[in-house]
């Protein structure tokens, strides 16, 4: 049966995808065939074939970026070290270990789901703009995060969430494969408004909040808080 595992990694970091037999295992590298591929597209990530040091079948996206340790393989550790993780690496990887002496029976089959994350930049909230006499517009921008964020606007007076119908979010996938988000909030003009824009990264369990206050139509952008006071289901920023 195929074992299933999950692992998380930050964009740009290195990660180990675990695929190992119990401790104390010993393998002959002239007998074992090891194959890492992506589960959906079956892209070849890396492999080991006895008496064959060339990896000509490895996909160009993984060449020189995905390695197994020969010393580890001798001990039954066929884990994959993946360098410089990119958002495109967020997928399922399948490790298959076959024994030639056992008639190419599968010795080990492990599927590892890699979740990729990147911190969003601290949001920037524009000074309020008045498209009409009875309306105020705020714009919140945050860039280079992963995965796709959630955006919330908060009434800072009581930490309540504003109605999401009042906001219009546009999420872009940028050239690096990371997300940029722009959220526009339209609210009725009031003498004094104290609001905040919250960018939530669910995978990182992280919220980035910037406040903007209007008093006589003067905007503030100096209330930057990571992990704001609890707003409903929002969590403190932790990385696990």
């Amino acid at each position: 049966d195929t074992q299933e595992k999950e692992v998380r990694a930050m964009v740009g970091s290195d990660v180990e995808l675990s695929c190992a037999c119990p401790e104390g295992s010993r393998f002959d590298l002239n007998d074992v065939y090891v194959y890492w591929q992506t589960s959906e597209s079956k892209t070849v990530v890396t492999y080991h074939i006895p008496q064959n040091s060339s990896l000509e079948n490895v996909d160009s996206r993984y060449r020189n970026r995905a390695l197994m340790s020969p010393a580890g393989m001798l001990r039954g550790d066929f884990s994959l070290r993946l360098f410089n993780v990119t958002p495109q690496d967020e997928q399922k990887f399948h490790c298959l270990v076959l024994s030639q002496s056992l008639g190419f029976q599968e010795v080990l089959s492990v599927e590892v789901t890699l979740h990729v994350a990147a911190n969003f930049s601290v949001p920037v909230v524009s000074a309020p703009h008045s498209p009409s006499q009875d309306e105020l517009t705020f714009t919140c921008t945050s860039i280079n995060g992963y995965p796709r964020p959630n955006v919330y606007w908060i009434n800072k007076t009581d930490n309540s969430l504003l109605d999401q119908a009042l906001q219009n979010d546009t999420v872009f996938l940028n050239m690096r494969g990371l997300y940029d988000v722009v959220s526009v909030l339209r609210i009725a003009r009031t003498p004094s408004v104290n609001i905040g824009c919250c960018i939530e990264n669910v995978l990182l369990q992280q919220n980035l909040t910037v406040g903007s206050q209007t008093g006589n139509d003067i905007g503030e952008r100096d209330k930057i808080t990571e992990n704001p006071v609890s707003t409903g289901e929002k969590n403190a920023a932790t990385w696990s």
Partner: antibody, heavy 118, light 107 residues
């Protein structure tokens, strides 16, 4: 234990259709390329078609446009849809598994006879 | 397409004999060659892959050699159960192709 069990052979008239099936067990079916090889009565082995683990398909010129290979990984099954059958397609058809990365046929089905006759 | 030519097409030998079957590819296939044994009314069985690697469970009297275009299958001491038809096959590129077979019969 790796096993490939075939079904679906039989008698068909020229121009007719038939669908062969091959059920795999004892291995992670979705991670292997699978092939069909045939053998006409008293003749040698002839490669027919292949489907890669990722779904890419390959055909011998003699069957291109008439045969379609497919797989259902959820059912651990391989199929060969044969249309516009001709007398020269009459053969025992074998499904075969290909060793990961290596490329040769390490396990074969038991074979199923396709008879094309009017 | 790569043509595979086997010789001889048939061969009579006795138990205990040493037998060699050759296979020639019409173009270089590195070591991407396999040998199969087939008995009447049975599916082929893999013997050798990568030109010289013995498949699991295959007796050591079977051996393969060669690379590029010329390959051989050798049975060092024929046993009664070895009388069958033998095929070579290239898996260097599609379409995969087989030799025409060598039928090994009892003398």
């Amino acid at each position: 234990e790796v096993q490939l069990v075939q079904s679906g052979g039989g008698l068909v008239h020229p121009g007719g259709s038939l669908r062969l099936s091959c059920a795999g067990s004892g291995f992670t079916f979705s991670s292997y390329a699978m092939h069909w090889v045939r053998q006409a009565p008293g003749k040698g082995l002839e490669w027919v078609s292949a489907i890669g683990a990722g779904g890419g398909t390959y055909y011998a010129d003699s069957v291109k446009g008439r045969f379609t290979i497919s797989r259902d990984n959820a059912k651990n099954s391989l199929y060969l849809q044969m249309n516009s059958l001709r007398a020269e397609d009459m053969a025992v058809y074998y499904c075969a598994r290909v060793v990961v990365v290596v490329g040769f046929f390490d396990y074969w089905g038991q074979g199923t006879l396709v008879t094309v006759s009017s | 397409d790569i043509q595979m030519t086997q010789s001889p097409s048939s061969l009579s030998a006795s138990v205990g004999d040493r037998v060699t079957i050759t296979c020639r590819a019409s173009q270089g296939i590195s070591s991407w060659l396999a040998w199969y044994q087939q008995k009447p009314e049975k599916a082929p069985k893999s013997l050798i892959f990568a030109a010289s690697s013995l498949q699991s469970g295959v007796p050591s009297r079977f051996s393969g050699s060669g690379s590029g275009t010329d390959f051989t299958l050798t049975i060092s001491s024929l046993q009664p159960e070895d009388f069958a038809t033998y095929y070579c096959q290239q898996y260097n590129s599609y379409p995969y192709t087989f030799g025409q077979g060598t039928k090994l019969e009892i003398k």
